[in-house]
């Protein structure tokens, strides 16, 4: 997929920043707000920000600029620069009247069909598990294969470097075609097929990608919030995977929740399957030692481990992936439209 250009975005923060630079008042306010960063630590939901008056004034001046409401895209060039601007401006939106974070990512809906050639899969045993089949589909695609090998190398060996591994994982889930990435990670396994379950759980190379000792979940979030990319991905996930009702209907749609979930892989908040025998997922962290923030910690942890929207989105995608291989398609090469969510 070609990377989205700035012009394809409704209101890119990079464009908005350039516009702002051309206006002396806006430019001065932006620079001032940027320098406020050190004096305003990013507040966590349990904290109230204390804001110097001059920062509030700069924020007020920015509220009328095109920077307010600017957005970024997950696959855009200069994404980190765009997100840096977004979070600087976000302070202007929320100062003095602390709002919950809003996802910086603009939704661009693509309904491009995914072309697959299943005929090449006949080199596999007919009873091979679906995780093996989806891995093979990735191998048969040059781009997917190249990106997978890159993270495979970075994440293997007894002395792997975790930060390098995470960067390559992030690159894979950002640049590989979405159906390939989703097929690889969200492949369905028979309930008793532990080998398949293990293959699925090892997709993201957890031995290297995940911390050897589980940190406290709130510490992990604090670390994540200090990085614009990780913060953006977490906020995007919490925006799109919020259950709207007790049935687990996602706040937006299942496909959007899954995209946000996959977007976390390679960040400090990398989730994974917890076992070989089911499809439960969790963060690699603990709420032990959270003191009076125990409830808040459990809420963060539960957003992954006990989220009916996410659970149902994963289950629906796995059902879809099962159907891909259970139908007699008219031709060995066929196009599969992006799966529409069931909700």
């Amino acid at each position: 997929d070609p990377l989205p250009t700035e012009s394809r975005l409704m209101n890119s923060c990079l464009q908005a920043r350039r516009k702002c630079q051309a206006d002396p008042t806006c430019s001065a306010a932006y620079h001032h707000l940027d320098s406020c960063t050190s004096s305003i630590s990013t507040p966590l939901p349990s904290e109230e920000p204390s804001v110097p008056a001059d920062c509030l004034e700069a924020a007020q001046q920015l509220r009328n600029s095109s920077l307010i409401g600017c957005m970024c895209h997950r696959r855009m060039k200069n994404q980190v620069a765009c997100l840096d601007i977004y979070w600087t401006v976000h302070r202007a939106r929320s100062l003095g009247n602390y709002e919950l974070d809003v996802s910086p990512y603009e939704d661009t809906v693509t309904s491009k069909p995914w072309k697959m050639n299943l005929s090449k899969l006949n080199m596999l045993k007919p009873d091979s598990d679906l995780c093996l089949k989806f891995a093979m589909l990735c191998t048969l695609n040059d781009k997917c294969d190249r990106l997978r090998k890159a993270y495979g190398e970075a994440c293997s060996g007894p002395h792997c470097q975790r930060h390098v591994c995470l960067r390559q994982l992030l690159t894979f889930f950002e640049k590989a075609a979405e159906p390939h990435a989703q097929g690889l990670l969200l492949c369905p396994c028979a309930p008793n097929d532990r080998g398949c379950g293990e293959r699925r759980r090892n997709t993201i190379a957890p031995n290297c990608a995940l911390p050897p000792v589980a940190p406290n979940c709130l510490e992990l979030r604090r670390l994540c919030f200090s990085d614009p990319l990780c913060r953006s991905r977490l906020v995007d996930f919490q925006t799109h995977c919020h259950p709207m009702d007790i049935l687990g209907t996602c706040a937006t749609e299942q496909s959007r929740c899954l995209r946000a979930y996959l977007g976390l892989i390679g960040t400090a908040m990398t989730p994974n399957f917890v076992s070989n025998v089911n499809t439960s997922v969790a963060l690699s962290c603990t709420c032990r030692g959270s003191g009076n923030l125990q409830e808040e910690c459990e809420m963060l942890e539960g957003f992954f481990s006990h989220n009916p929207c996410l659970t149902e989105a994963i289950a629906a995608k796995m059902r879809f992936h099962s159907q891909l291989f259970s139908q007699d398609w008219p031709h060995p090469t066929f196009a599969v439209m992006a799966h529409q969510n069931e909700n």
């Epitope: 007790i246 499809t279 439960s280 809420m299 006990h306 009916p308 659970t311 796995m318």
Partner: antibody, heavy 123, light 107 residues
Framework: EVQLVESGAEVKKSGSSVKVSCKAS????????ISWVRQAPGQGLEWMGG????????NYAQKFQGRVTLTTDESTSTAYMELSSLRSEDTAVYYC????????????????WGQGTLVTVSS | DIQMTQSPSSLSASVGDRVTITCRAS??????LNWYQQKPGKAPKLLIY???SLQSGVPSRFSGSGSGTDFTLTISSLQPEDFATYHC?????????FGQGTRLEIK
């Protein structure tokens, strides 16, 4: 295994309110969806609403919107259902139930249930 | 709202009989259907979830089938403890709705 214990029977005057409690034990309370279902004498089951404390997600059946309030107290693992402007037709047994989710297959069912609280509304 | 209609409303049967209760949804609900058993003065008890999965601890004489709009609860050989009221319930969409119940009595 989660268990639910509801508060005792209530007799209320028409126009007043009733607050029924449902205490959970044996599981992490905030992670479950708690629903309320009522059953008038000799009638079928009627869903009133549900809450997922973890996400602050709340749903009410249209029929009860504005009259019912569902809340939870996580420190005591207790869910509450308050019904206001009571009328004689509200005489029923009120059940709380864990609305199970997270199975990864076709979602959601009620299990387990509380023992029920009989609310009698007299005019 | 999705209407759930059970039939029959009541039926009489003898121990050892095979009994079938049906539940029809006013629109397709895929397999998002559950069955409960309720005895007088007691809370309902889950028997079958997701149309055909047997809840653990429930005897295998109970079975469920169907998808879309038509569902069936079957008791293959009635036992004395099976005489009760049976309810179907959909969890496809909010509001969650129940059938009106089927009362199973001893003939």
């Amino acid at each position: 295994e989660v268990q639910l214990v509801e508060s005792g029977a209530e007799v209320k005057k028409s126009g007043s309110s009733v607050k029924v409690s449902c205490k959970a034990s044996g599981g992490t309370f905030s992670r479950y969806a708690i629903s309320w279902v009522r059953q008038a004498p000799g009638q079928g089951l009627e869903w009133m609403g549900g809450i997922i404390p973890l996400f602050g997600t709340l749903n009410y059946a249209q029929k009860f919107q504005g009259r019912v309030t569902l809340t939870t107290d996580e420190s005591t693992s207790t869910a509450y259902m308050e019904l206001s402007s009571l009328r004689s037709e509200d005489t029923a047994v009120y059940y709380c139930a864990v609305f199970y989710y997270g199975s990864g297959s076709y979602r959601n069912w009620f299990d387990p249930w509380g023992q029920g609280t009989l609310v009698t509304v007299s005019s | 709202d999705i209407q759930m209609t059970q039939s029959p409303s009541s039926l009489s049967a003898s121990v050892g009989d095979r009994v079938t209760i049906t539940c029809r949804a006013s629109q397709s609900i895929s397999s998002y259907l559950n069955w409960y058993q309720q005895k007088p003065g007691k809370a309902p008890k889950l028997l079958i979830y997701a149309a055909s999965s047997l809840q653990s601890g429930v005897p295998s004489r109970f079975s469920g089938s169907g998808s879309g709009t038509d569902f069936t609860l079957t008791i293959s050989s009635l036992q004395p403890e099976d005489f009760a009221t049976y309810h179907c319930q959909q969890s496809y969409s909010i509001p969650i709705t129940f059938g009106q119940g089927t009362r199973l009595e001893i003939k």
